[in-house]
């Protein structure tokens, strides 16, 4: 039996201040070293404690990069991207890509490579549902006390 | 722990070259991030070069404004050993040269390189450019 894994993919907008010791993360990737298969994109690898990205609480490992102040990290080598990071300035805008894993079933199998998400009302419907039991069972207790 | 011993300083003419050797002990060297870093009398010791090994089969390298095109940083993870490869030197190119080592082989730190990163220092090879 094949587990699956589905994801929701989010994209997201994070403005950094550069801290006293810098951004704070390291990352992996680019077109000459793939750390995902079929995929020449820049992800963090490590967010350093203290850091302005652990401060700001937004960024997290295994992050897709996508953009540095505007400019596209698609189709770059791994130096060219450490270089841009670099030379990026004070105040950093990254273009994130989050990816959350929402589920693992039994059919079949999704590769690292495919972003496609889950349908949102698979993980609002289960929510609703046990809201309701929880909001049954609170006023069930109150009328015996 | 790791040890760092420079060697390969001297004194040189202007526009010369030398070749700045560190050979580290103690620590897998293809997961240590290197760097070469200088004091001249009465100043702060400074950052000159930086090199990585990302962990994917590549290495990266970084260097001060000053150096860019005249100094050459890399490493022989066979032999441990970190270079400083410097041609065209200048007489402001004189200092006290230190090897530093750090440990982070989770890819490539997007940060400049800061004197704080780094956690093991060698003793350090005098280069004077008269």
């Known amino acids: 039996m094949n587990g699956r894994v589905d994801y929701l993919v989010t994209e997201e907008e994070i403005n950094l201040t550069r801290g006293p010791s810098g951004l704070g993360f390291n990352i992996v990737g680019g077109t000459d070293q793939q750390y995902v298969s079929n995929d020449s994109g820049i992800y963090v690898s490590r967010i350093k404690e203290n850091g302005a990205a652990a401060l700001d609480g937004r960024l997290q490992e295994g992050d897709k990069i996508l953009s540095v102040n505007g400019q596209d990290l698609k189709n770059l080598l791994h130096q060219d991207a450490v270089d841009l990071f670099r030379n990026a300035g004070y105040a950093v805008s990254l273009r994130v890509q989050h990816r959350l894993q929402v589920q693992n079933g039994p059919i079949g199998h999704r590769g690292e490579g495919d972003p496609s998400g889950i349908p949102i009302f698979m993980v609002l419907v289960p929510v609703f549902a046990l809201t309701m039991v929880a909001a049954w069972a609170f006023m069930r207790y109150r009328q015996q006390l | 722990h790791v040890q760092l011993v420079e060697s390969g300083g001297g004194s040189v003419q202007a526009g010369g070259s030398l070749r700045l050797s560190c050979a580290a002990s103690g620590r897998t060297f293809s997961s240590l991030r290197m760097a070469w870093f200088r004091q001249a009398p009465g100043k702060e010791r400074e950052f000159v070069a930086e090199n990585w090994w990302n962990g994917q089969g590549g290495q990266g390298v970084w260097y001060v404004d000053s150096v860019k095109g005249r100094f050459t940083i890399s490493r022989d993870n066979a032999k441990n050993t970190l270079y400083l490869q410097m041609n065209n030197l200048k007489p402001e190119d004189t200092a006290v040269y230190y090897c530093?080592?750090?440990?982070?082989?989770?890819?490539?730190?997007?940060?400049?390189?800061?004197?704080?990163?780094?956690?093991?220092w060698g003793q350090g090879t005098q280069v004077t450019v008269s």
């Open positions: 530093a080592a750090h440990r982070d082989d989770s890819g490539s730190t997007v940060d400049p390189p800061n004197q704080s990163d780094y956690d093991y």
